[in-house]
Amino acid sequence: SKLKDPELSLKGTQHIMQAGQTLHLQCRGEAAHKWSLPEMVSKESERLSITKSACGRNGKQFCSTLTLNTAQANHTGFYSCKYLAVPTSKKKETESAIYIFISDTGRPFVEMYSEIPEIIHMTEGRELVIPCRVTSPNITVTLKKFPLDTLIPDGKRIIWDSRKGFIISNATYKEIGLLTCEATVNGHLYKTNYLTHRQTNTIIDVQISTPRPVKLLRGHTLVLNCTATTPLNTRVQMTWSYPDEKNKRASVRRRIDQSNSHANIFYSVLTIDKMQNKDKGLYTCRVRSGPSFKSVNTSVHIYDKAFITVKHRKQQVLETVAGKRSYRLSMKVKAFPSPEVVWLKDGLPATEKSARYLTRGYSLIIKDVTEEDAGNYTILLSIKQSNVFKNLTATLIVNVK
């Protein structure tokens, strides 16, 4: 059977009390319940006490009394009592709340930003709340825009709500700048300042700054760095999707570089320790800003152990002619990780033998070919940390014109 709503000792939707007084609020219900409190109240350990007891006829009901000693203006907010362990579908039916104003003539605004304005991010066309909520619903508040404008509530585009502040239903460029909420109490003018900062949703570029595809040995650490570049007034959400996401294999670090005077650079660094075969596959970095969306992906290959395979690109015996500007002697190599490469000519390191010999990847380039360049060329490939070595020899014949 449906539980009856928990009942609060203070009736109605709101209650006004004076700062310095003690707030007593009892919640009575048919099951165990918990309190949901304004942020500043939750932090109070000295002033706040909650006592639980059995109550009602035969002690069959659950009671909980909240006591807040010397209540302060910044304790203003919603106090609600809700049943524990109630199916989500019934949540709405099993909560009772009251908004308590803790009135303080010396502090009309719950949050005061009289020196440094609070930054509020806004998007044109979206709702913007100037959160100058008050400690009493009867305080007259005006919203000023620097230098001389007053933003007047019209009940629709601009709404005043003493529990929230000024709600601007679809913000325009007119609300960008320094906004001040003003209240005069007992002849004293109080001001709280907000600086609205227009956010755009432009994503200039998204990149994964690692080679594609990424190749890794099993057991090694994967580090992928995704960078998103945006205009200065854009904020982004960066998320990753990857093969073993369900097990939350990755740790993600985020940072923002605002040193550039023209753009923000957002970094999201994904790290997975001890890579396994199940971690191979597609890694996608998704960047969202409002309705804008960009993504970039890379493939990750996992190898069980280091390997080298080497083959002749053409045949084992190669021919060229003396006087040729340059000749490339090349082998077909597949290896992971990248091996060290040394070329030998007739058993001796080729590049030490002559300055005309240059190593480029898995190729040896011979500049200004002469008759003496004929001989046996051996490629030595080594992955020392894994003790993997391979070599292959080719013979070069140099014909004289």
Partner: antibody
Framework: QVQLQQPGAELVKPGASVKLFCKAS????????IYWMRQRPGKGLEWIGE????????TFNEKFKTKATLTVDKSSSTAYMQLSSLTSEDSAVYYC??????????????WGQGTSVTVSS | DIVMTQAAFSNPVTLGTSASISCRSS???????????LYWYLQKPGQSPQLLIY???NLASGVPDRFSSSGSGTDFTLRISRVEAEDVGVYYC?????????FGEGTKLEIK
Amino acid sequence: QVQLQQPGAELVKPGASVKLFCKASGYTFTNYYIYWMRQRPGKGLEWIGEINPSNGDTTFNEKFKTKATLTVDKSSSTAYMQLSSLTSEDSAVYYCTRPSFYSYDYYKDYWGQGTSVTVSS
Amino acid sequence: DIVMTQAAFSNPVTLGTSASISCRSSKSLLHSNGITYLYWYLQKPGQSPQLLIYQMSNLASGVPDRFSSSGSGTDFTLRISRVEAEDVGVYYCAQNLELPWTFGEGTKLEIK
């Protein structure tokens, strides 16, 4: 207390212009809109437009855009409406009103007594 | 523009009994924010109009609780639970969901 003072009557000739005033007192003039309304004899109310006294921003009923000009003088807390090229159709009572869309004012609005404009040769 | 429609006269009522005045809008006045932008005004003989009800069902400051209002998005009713002599006049409904504000032609409350 809040008051909006308007002159009782204006008699003007066809084709001429008239500048009506609405002097506000008892509140901060720049903190509330001023609306202007028209009521022709035996007819309903028509909304002409509004002005934000803090910056002079105006919004009009399209129907009155070429007919009415709204201005304010902050130093004297006075709102003005100039009506041009008057015809007998413009004979009506013109009200200025100060609506409140603040919860602590409980949406109370204040109306001037209205100025009766008669267009006649 | 949104058109507000009202009957010119109410059914004559006896003092102390209840009265109802109807109003219809050509478009729903229910905004996506949940507020219905309908207002009721009373213009007593020889006086300026005064606000009675704001946003369909809220009583304006200083208005006796004999007055109440309800409705859907397009059909609205103003109720006076115990009519008093001072309630005579013309009742206007108005909308400000969209500019311009538009008013009904007014319903005159008649006493028997």
